[in-house]
């Protein structure tokens, strides 16, 4: 379907033509369930929430509504040479029994993620192959997509930037010196943080950093960097904050776990990354976000998820977590407590927790 956002003069600033498929994991009384559905043909642009961006202040956004209160939002940003969907967000209403039968919660959920949708200014983004955007418990796949923002004349430009998946892979040629865009999955590392009162963090997980940055040639790239078991780990134990620091000579990654005393839940609340990127226009890369709520479980229990999880830290950084089991604040006998599995893993014998 074609979606369009126009400015006050009636000129389109965003045009998007794609079909979308949603895969959503949610809880039912009888355990976790996965629903897959397509963006319906009657999906419409929410005109009063979509925008061409306010002069000098904000970037354009496309908000698409369908069903009973579900919205898919694409937030765009640009620099001198490129534009991108810096953030895709999906709001879904679990009380919609048509899409989410027997959902144990009736709440409205919001998930979001950075994307790889980017193109040269004055060219359209084109991706015939599926473009997948992973969010917490949701995967959105765009098929046969033509998208352009910062438009000039209400029509797609002649030129196009093709997505990686559409480009033919070279059969020969010298190996690239730069890290691959999607490297092999990271290796599982074991972490243990001990304070005066014993162990306050026990974790087994494979971590990957997805970093979007501007290279010296002014091209924007998204690269994945695996955290190695050989990296040095350290940390600290506090009453309300437990930190895990994993570092090597090029980077320092700090994970901060917080606790909600009233609900007795621990969760990943902060991520801080300092890293050197030799081929970046600004080689020193620093990002932090202290308002996260991921990897959440009851204090005394452990959070476990075998499925890959993408934690959106900022538009430049996403933390990908594989095969995670983590327990913070209260750890008895240096062993994981009862398991609270993520919804995606779908083993209904265990207690499941929203996050």
């Amino acid at each position: 379907a074609m979606f369009m956002v126009k400015n006050g003069n009636g000129t389109a600033c965003i045009m998007a033509n794609f079909s979308a498929a949603f895969s959503v994991n949610y809880d039912t009384k009888s355990g976790p369930k996965n629903m897959t559905f397509d963006l319906p043909s009657d999906a419409t642009v929410v005109l009063n929430r979509s925008s061409c961006g306010k002069e000098n202040t904000s970037d354009p956004s496309l908000v698409i509504a369908f069903g009973r209160g579900h919205t898919l939002t694409l937030n765009f940003t640009r620099n001198a040479t490129r534009y991108s969907v810096q953030l895709m967000s999906f709001v879904y209403n679990l009380s919609d029994t048509h899409l989410f039968p027997n959902a144990s919660s009736k709440e409205i959920k919001t998930v979001e993620s950075i994307t790889d949708i980017r193109a040269d200014i004055d060219k359209k983004y084109r991706c015939v192959s599926g473009t997948q955007v992973h969010m917490n418990n949701v995967t959105v796949t765009l098929h046969d997509a033509t998208i352009q923002a910062y438009l000039s004349n209400s029509s797609f430009s002649r030129g196009e930037t093709r997505c990686e998946q559409d480009r033919p892979s070279p059969t020969t040629g010298p190996p690239s010196p730069s890290p691959p865009l999607v490297p092999t999955n990271p290796t599982v590392s074991k972490y243990n943080v001990t304070g005066n009162n014993g162990t306050c963090l026990l974790a087994s997980m494979a971590l990957q950093l997805n970093i979007t940055y501007l290279k010296k040639d002014n091209k924007t790239v998204t690269r994945a960097f695996n955290i190695s078991p050989n990296d040095t780990s350290s940390g600290s134990c506090g009453i309300n904050l437990v930190t895990l620091k994993v570092e090597n000579k090029n980077r320092a990654l700090e994970l901060q776990f917080g606790m909600n005393a009233s609900s007795s839940l621990f969760f990943l609340q902060g991520v801080r990354l300092n890293m050197t990127l030799p081929d970046a226009l600004v080689p020193t890369f620093s990002i932090s976000n202290h308002s996260l709520k991921a990897l959440q479980a009851t204090v005394g229990n452990s959070y476990k998820c075998n499925t890959e999880e993408h934690i959106f830290v900022s538009k430049m950084l996403s933390l990908n977590v594989f095969s995670v089991q983590v327990q913070a604040f209260k750890v008895d006998s240096d062993r994981f407590g009862s398991v609270e599995e993520c919804v995606q893993d779908g083993n209904s014998m265990h207690h499941h927790h929203h996050h």
Partner: antibody, heavy 118, light 106 residues
Amino acid sequence: QVQLQQSGAELVKPGASVKMSCKASGYIFTNYNIHWVKKSPGQGLEWIGAIYPGNGDAPYSQKFKDKATLTADKSSSTTYMQLSRLTSEDSAVYYCVRANWDVAFAYWGQGTLVSVSA
Amino acid sequence: DIQMTQSPPSLSASLGGKVTITCKASQDIDRYMAWYQDKPGKGPRLLIHDTSTLQPGIPSRFSGSGSGRDYSFSISNLEPEDIATYYCLQYDNLWTFGGGTKLEIK
């Protein structure tokens, strides 16, 4: 209509720096890149760099990345170019230019003449 | 940066005649090519964009063609006011001018 008004001619000594301005009017300043182009008898037209006033992002030509610094002031819709460590090779007319979307460089300022002389 | 090789550096032609200038890019520029006329004491003037699209007000004596890495620009029925230096510009990946061609009338 679109107008780009550049600052006046400059006579500067070798080794010094110069900062010239380009005031834009007749359109939304943050919607378009402003480019800077050098015109000299020896080298013809050369693209120096561009700046996107929305966020200050500024790609440069490899040749000028250590010579030129581009900045923009959204409040006055003005773009600036500073040239450092000037030599006689930098004597030229410098133009600020705006593209018309994908129609290349359509709008040109009147140019700023820089003369480097001891 | 993409390099643009423009030739010839200078040429001389008769009034009423035709001239052709070529530009070769160091890589495929997907027809993102423009041509400019530059006269002493005046700012450059855009004649053609997108390889072959004439700007409003530019006479049809001017024309452009090409694809991939190779592009050409022609002026037919030369007139005295065509005396100028002509430049190509690629704007597919950043922006690069060619070295210029100085046109003189015999």
